[in-house]
Every structure is written in C-alpha cells, then in structure tokens.
C-alpha cells in the first residue's frame, strides 16, 4: 500500500479521499468534512490540513485553501432548521404562511408571503412550498367571507325560508326558522404547506390578494459551491 | 446525562511521558469533535488541539505540537491525550471539552491535574 | 494568533448592582464565546455567539459586540455569579481564551 504522497502509475489515478496535486506530481490526501488544506503537499510531505474557523465549513472531503463562509442569518420571514457547523452551511425554510419564490441550488434565496384569497374567492389550489395559493371565485351557490389562504369556497346554508340571499362573499341568511346545511359550519381550512430549505432572503412585495401573478425581485448570484472536492 | 470523565490526577517526573483518558457517555462518540485545553495553575486557558473522531485526524495548536498526542478508542468511546517530555511547565490542570462542531465548547470533562516534580 | 484582553482582571459588585466586562480581540472576530469558572470547577459555556445564553443561564446574564469589542453585562448581580469569566474565539486559528476577569461579591 503507497502512503501519500505518492506517484500515481502512468495513466493511473489517486484513490479514494486522494488527489492529484499537480505541482508536486504526486498523490495526496484531501481533508475531511471541517477541514480544510492549510498546507499543501509536496514530493515528500502529505497536506497539512487545519479545522474550519467560525461561521466556516466543508461538507465534502476536499483541498480547499478556505472553508466556505456559512449563509448569512436567516431572515424575519425564516426560521433556521439547520445552524452553521464546521460540516454543514445554515439551512433557512420559509415560516408558515409563506413558500419559496425563487429556488437556488440548495434550499430557497427568496421566501413570499402565500397569497390570501379575499372574499369572494376561494383557495382552489394550496400553496405549496414551492409554488404560491391559487384563488377562484366561487361559484354560484358557494361562498367565502374571508382573506385567506387556507379557506375554500363552501357551500351557502339552505334555508326553508330565504331572508338574504347568499353571494360569493357572503352566507344566505335565513328566516328563524333552522337551516339545514350540507356541510358543518365554519371555515374549511386547507393544511399550510411544509416549507423548504431557503436562504439569503429579500423583502417580499406585498401579498396580491386576487389571483393573478405574483412578481419576484431580482437577486445576486448564489455563492460558488465547493467545486470538484467530492469523494 | 452527557458527560466526559477524565482519569485522576496523575504526578510524574520531569522527562517522562504521562497519558490521560477522557471517557464519553450518553452519545455517538464519532458525532462529536475533541478538544483539549490546557489551565496553568487556575490562570487562563490554552487550546492543545481537536481530534475528530469520525475521521481520525487531528490539529493542534503549534506550540503543542510534539509536545501533545491526541487519539481515539471508538470503541470505549474514550478519547486520549498524551504529553511528552514533561517540564514544570507542564503542570497544569488538563481538560478534555466537545465542541459539537461549532466553535465553542458545550461539554467540559471533570480536568486532570498533571503534577511534574522530581 | 489573536490575543483576547480582557478587562478589568479582577472586579467587585454589591448584590444588585449592574456589571459590565470586555473583552478586545487583536483582530477582528466573527463571534465572541464566554465561559463562567469557580473554583475547583471545570468552566462552563454561558454566552455563544456573542448574545446566546447557555442552557440553564439566567436571563440577567446578556453578551453583545462586534468587531474587535466584546462585553458580558450582568443586569443585577448576585451572589451565585461570583465566579471567573473567560472570553473565546475561533475566528482565526488556534482558538484563543482571554486571561479572565474575576467577579467578586462585596
């Protein structure tokens, strides 16, 4: 077995957790997760390899001069799921009620507030933790009377006797007489969606709260990943 | 609960070797980085070096290199720390602490007092 | 390295009273740490990243700073905090501890 470093046979590569470092034309050890390469190699002596300082990490093995700077914090609109470690950058996710705008490489660069549906309309399709609320207006015979992004158009109560018709923004209202109903009273909710892993957020313009397109804010490049450093 | 016990005081003669344990209970031992740190006569605090035991590898701070060894028994999950070539100056109270990857110590053991004295 | 200076080394303060120690760093650090020591007691991690409190740390206990400029407040001092305090960081290699202020009870 050749200790590092060594000369690879012609036409030969390095093994695993090994790389080729070409000024000294030798085989070398690269540095595990939370190291980093404070001394290179040379054709008598292995790299030299020192921890990640603070806010610092590699999360692959790797022969990197630096660590790469952890994210900055995470944003009012984010909770941080994962904290900065010498193995692993910090993970932000968009907080309930919000999903991820604009995707990066891992997790998220802008969350956006969901959509609410004002009265009128209905969620006719969930936020999801990638993609906003869809509202539509609900149809006759149904209604909602909120701003929401969870709540459905429901059904209006039927009355033996009409005393206010209902609309799409409001219930019927009927004579004293008791109603019947197709469905239980209150509002139906849809589940708020997971949110996924985010990072360097903006603010967010307002929430529309008719359907429609929601506008993104433009955003700098993401930072450069930790190139060819894998096993 | 999560602690680190660390072996008794120990007195030895200038010029010997002294190796002291630092055993770890109640964790994945590999999930958790290493460290000592040296305290001369209840003054301040020295960083030696950290042991990662998922990988084996080690750094020290360079004014203990040759002078502090660093290794790892996974399987009593005990990590160990030898210092050589004793001088006076090496008395001192020696603590074992983790780091759980971040950059402060969250679990201190209970200190070895080294004592070197002909 | 850096060197951490902790001032004032030793220090008193009646029950009550506010107290504030520093700690200057020779470069500038990311996060400063403190540790709270008694005698015959290992230290014991009490602020990280500069303002978070340790498990189990009162809430009187507050960290801040940035930069070079550091400092550990005690908002209204008692008895159990007469203890030694150590600054840390690790923003530079090796990481490195101040020589301590001493906080005595009058």
């Known amino acids: 077995v050749a200790f590092t470093p060594y000369a690879p046979e012609p036409g030969g590569t390095c093994r695993l957790r090994e790389y080729y470092d070409q000024t000294a034309q030798m085989c070398c050890s690269k540095c595990p997760p939370g190291q980093h390469a404070k001394v290179f190699c040379t054709k008598t002596s292995d790299t030299v390899c020192d921890s990640c300082e603070d806010s610092t990490y590699t999360q692959l093995w790797n022969w990197v001069p630096e660590c790469l700077s952890c994210g900055s914090r995470c944003s009012s609109d984010q909770v941080e799921t994962q904290a900065c470690t010498r193995e692993q950058n910090r993970i932000c996710t968009c907080r309930p009620g919000w999903y991820c705008a604009l995707s990066k490489q891992e997790g998220c660069r802008l969350c956006a507030q969901l959509r609410k549906c004002r009265p009128g309309f209905g969620v006719a399709r969930p936020g999801t933790e990638t993609s906003d609320v869809v509202c539509k207006p609900c149809a006759p015979g149904t209604f909602s009377n909120t701003t929401s992004s969870t709540d459905i158009c429901r059904p209006h109560q039927i009355c033996h006797v009409v005393a206010i018709p209902g609309n799409a923004s409001m219930d019927a209202v009927c004579t004293s007489t008791s109603p019947t109903r197709s469905m239980a009273p209150g509002a139906v909710h849809l589940p708020q969606p997971v949110s996924t892993r985010s990072q360097h957020t903006q603010p967010t313009p307002a929430p529309s709260t008719a359907p429609g397109t929601s506008f993104l804010l433009p955003v700098g490049p993401s930072p450069p990943a930790e190139g060819s450093t894998g096993d | 609960e999560f602690q680190l016990q660390q072996s008794g005081p120990e007195l030895v003669k200038p010029g010997a070797s002294v190796k002291i344990s630092c055993k770890a209970s109640?964790?994945?031992?590999?999930?958790?980085?290493m460290n000592w740190v040296k305290q001369s006569n209840g003054k301040s605090l020295e960083w030696i070096g950290i042991?990662?035991?998922?990988?084996?590898?080690?750094s020290y701070n360079q004014k203990f290199k040759g002078k502090a060894t660093l290794t790892v028994d996974q399987s009593s999950s005990t990590a160990y720390m030898q210092l050589n070539s004793l001088t006076s100056e090496d008395s001192a109270v020696y603590y074992c602490?983790?780091?759980?990857?971040?950059?402060?110590?969250?679990?201190w053991g209970t200190g070895t007092t080294v004592t070197v004295s002909s | 390295q850096i060197v951490l200076t902790q001032s004032p080394a030793l220090m008193s303060a009646s029950p009550g009273e506010k107290v504030t120690m520093t700690c200057s760093a020779s470069s500038s650090v990311t996060y400063m740490y403190w540790y709270q020591q008694k005698p015959r007691s290992s230290p014991k991690p009490w602020i990280y990243?500069?303002?978070n409190l340790a498990s189990g740390v009162p809430a009187r206990f507050s960290g801040s700073g940035s930069g070079t400029s550091y400092s550990l407040t005690i908002s209204s001092m008692e008895a159990e905090d007469a203890a030694t305090y150590y600054c840390q960081q690790w923003s530079s290699n090796p990481p490195t501890f101040g020589s301590g202020t001493k906080l005595e009870i009058k």
């Open positions: 602490a983790t780091d759980g990857g971040t950059w402060y110590f969250d679990v």
């Open positions: 042991i990662f035991p998922k990988y084996g590898t080690t």
């Open positions: 990243l500069t303002s």
């Open positions: 109640s964790y994945s031992f590999t999930d958790y980085n």
